[in-house]
Interface confidence: low
């Protein structure tokens, strides 16, 4: 650009565009400066004066170079089932993600809108698919020869111990009980303890329920177990 138009505001050449970190102001018909992240346009440019920028107020932010008249409001505080993985600053919004042991049942552009606790498989059921940041645990009934005696979101069905003499046969929720001599345990593939997933950023996923063996239970639920101390996240 010629020297006389190197400083904003300036009129762009016919068919030309404004430079990086500048915007074209329709009213002034000039290329004017954008405001940096953490600031907003307090006074718009004219033909003779450039944009006047000002810092964002508390609990507001701008993440990009901009010419917005007001900074954006940071999201509400994270609920008790979430952790704040990014604080609200003048340059970035607060990001809430689900805390460990929870998964994101309803995402938003950044972070998670609604967390749900990972389902716990009841005795007689083991983890078929472990929970992730965005999906619930899926439980399955323990197959013959395997059992789970725990209420857990990580334990899979384990093989019954093999007895020389069986005192009490095992079932889906109880290991076999041997009489006296030392038992051996059959080596079923994948008989391992699954790690608890750690929540980070998340995307939308459909809640996936899982069976339980609770007597007389019924309503088939799309979200996992919820402890008393759960925060409200709203839809």
């Amino acid at each position: 650009l010629p020297a006389q138009v190197a400083f904003t505001p300036y009129a762009p050449e016919p068919g030309g565009t404004c430079r990086l970190r500048e915007y074209y102001d329709q009213t002034a018909q000039m290329c004017c400066s954008k405001c940096p992240p953490g600031q907003h346009a307090k006074v718009f440019c004219t033909k003779t004066s450039d944009t006047v920028c000002d810092s964002c107020e508390d609990s507001t932010y701008t993440q990009l170079w901009n010419w917005v008249p007001e900074c954006l409001s940071c999201g509400s505080r994270c609920s008790s089932d979430q952790v704040e993985t990014q604080a609200c600053t003048r340059e970035q919004n607060r990001i809430c993600t689900c805390r460990p042991g929870w998964y994101c049942a309803l995402s938003k552009q950044e972070g998670c809108r609604l967390c749900a606790q990972l389902r716990k498989c009841r005795p007689g059921f083991g983890v078929a698919r472990p929970g992730t940041e965005t999906s619930d645990v899926v439980c399955k009934p323990c197959a013959p020869g395997t059992f789970s005696n725990t209420t857990s979101s990580t334990d899979i069905c384990r093989p019954h111990q093999i007895c020389h003499v069986v005192a009490i046969p095992g079932n889906a929720s109880m290991d076999a009980v041997c009489t006296s001599t030392s038992p051996t345990r059959s080596m079923a593939p994948g008989a391992v303890h699954l790690p608890q997933p750690v929540s980070t950023r998340s995307q939308h996923t459909q809640p996936t329920p899982a069976p339980s063996t609770a007597p007389g239970t019924s309503f088939l639920l799309p979200v996992g177990p919820s402890p008393p101390a759960e925060g409200s996240t709203g839809d």
Partner: antibody, heavy 116, light 110 residues
Framework: QSLEESGGRLVTPGTPLTLTCTVS????????MIWVRQAPGKGLEYIGF?????SAWYASWAKGRFTISKTSTTVDREITSPTTEDTATYFC?????????????WGPGTLVTVSS | AYDMTQTPASVEVAVGGTVTIKCQAS??????LAWYQQKPGQRPKLLIY???TLASGVPSRFKGSGSGTQFTLTISGVECADAATYYC????????????FGGGTEVVVK
């Protein structure tokens, strides 16, 4: 353990109406609540539910038309701007959010009539 | 998503006969289906959950079966007390659905 809906009455179209489901012998910090309605001579229609922490999910048709909220012993469901199509018996039902949950516990229902 | 289609809308059966009610989901809901019985002026009563598990206190003449998208409620040895409307209900996803219930089936006992 019991549930009882209240607040059902005759209202004119556009008049906001709040229905309350009062629980007895149930800990709403571990139980969730579902709202269902039934127009005269029609089937059951799911409205939405609220989880123990207070987060609410709604049927797609009910978003913006209904608001569900709760206290420690009650769950409220507001019809923001009732129309004659909202005339129905409204039920609340509770279930354990652990495992399947349990909806054998339903309130008797409360009748809402929207008429000019 | 997860629309529930219940058939027939109405069925007539003689005492001692058998009734079959079908419920179809528009997408797989695995085994997350419950059946309810409702009589006029009363609240719904749970009969079966997780597709085939009988709820406490429900007579064994009620039987649920199916998985995925196709489900069936069978009432064998029908009694006069079984005259009611029966609803299926999916429990796989409540987040963005129109209704979790089927349209209902009226059972008339002759």
């Amino acid at each position: 353990q019991s549930l009882e809906e209240s607040g059902g009455r005759l209202v004119t179209p556009g008049t906001p109406l709040t229905l309350t489901c009062t629980v007895s012998g149930i800990d709403l910090s571990t139980y969730a609540m579902i709202w269902v309605r039934q127009a005269p001579g029609k089937g059951l229609e799911y409205i939405g539910f609220i989880r123990p922490g207070g987060s609410a999910w709604y049927a797609s048709w009910a978003k913006g038309r209904f608001t569900i909220s709760k206290t420690s012993t009650t769950v409220d469901r507001e019809i923001t701007s009732p129309t004659t199509e909202d005339t129905a018996t409204y039920f609340c039902a509770t279930y354990d959010t652990y495992g399947y949950g349990d909806t054998r516990l339903w309130g008797p229902g409360t009748l809402v009539t929207v008429s000019s | 998503a997860y629309d529930m289609t219940q058939t027939p809308a109405s069925v007539e059966v003689a005492v001692g006969g058998t009734v079959t009610i079908k419920c179809q989901a528009s997408e797989s809901i695995f085994s997350y289906l419950a059946w309810y019985q409702q009589k006029p002026g009363q609240r719904p009563k749970l009969l079966i959950y997780y597709a085939s598990t009988l709820a406490s206190g429900v007579p064994s003449r009620f039987k649920g079966s199916g998985s995925g998208t196709q489900f069936t409620l069978t009432i064998s040895g029908v009694e006069c007390a079984d005259a009611a409307t029966y609803y299926c209900q999916q429990g796989y996803d409540f987040s963005a659905v129109d209704n979790v219930f089927g349209g209902g089936t009226e059972v008339v006992v002759k």
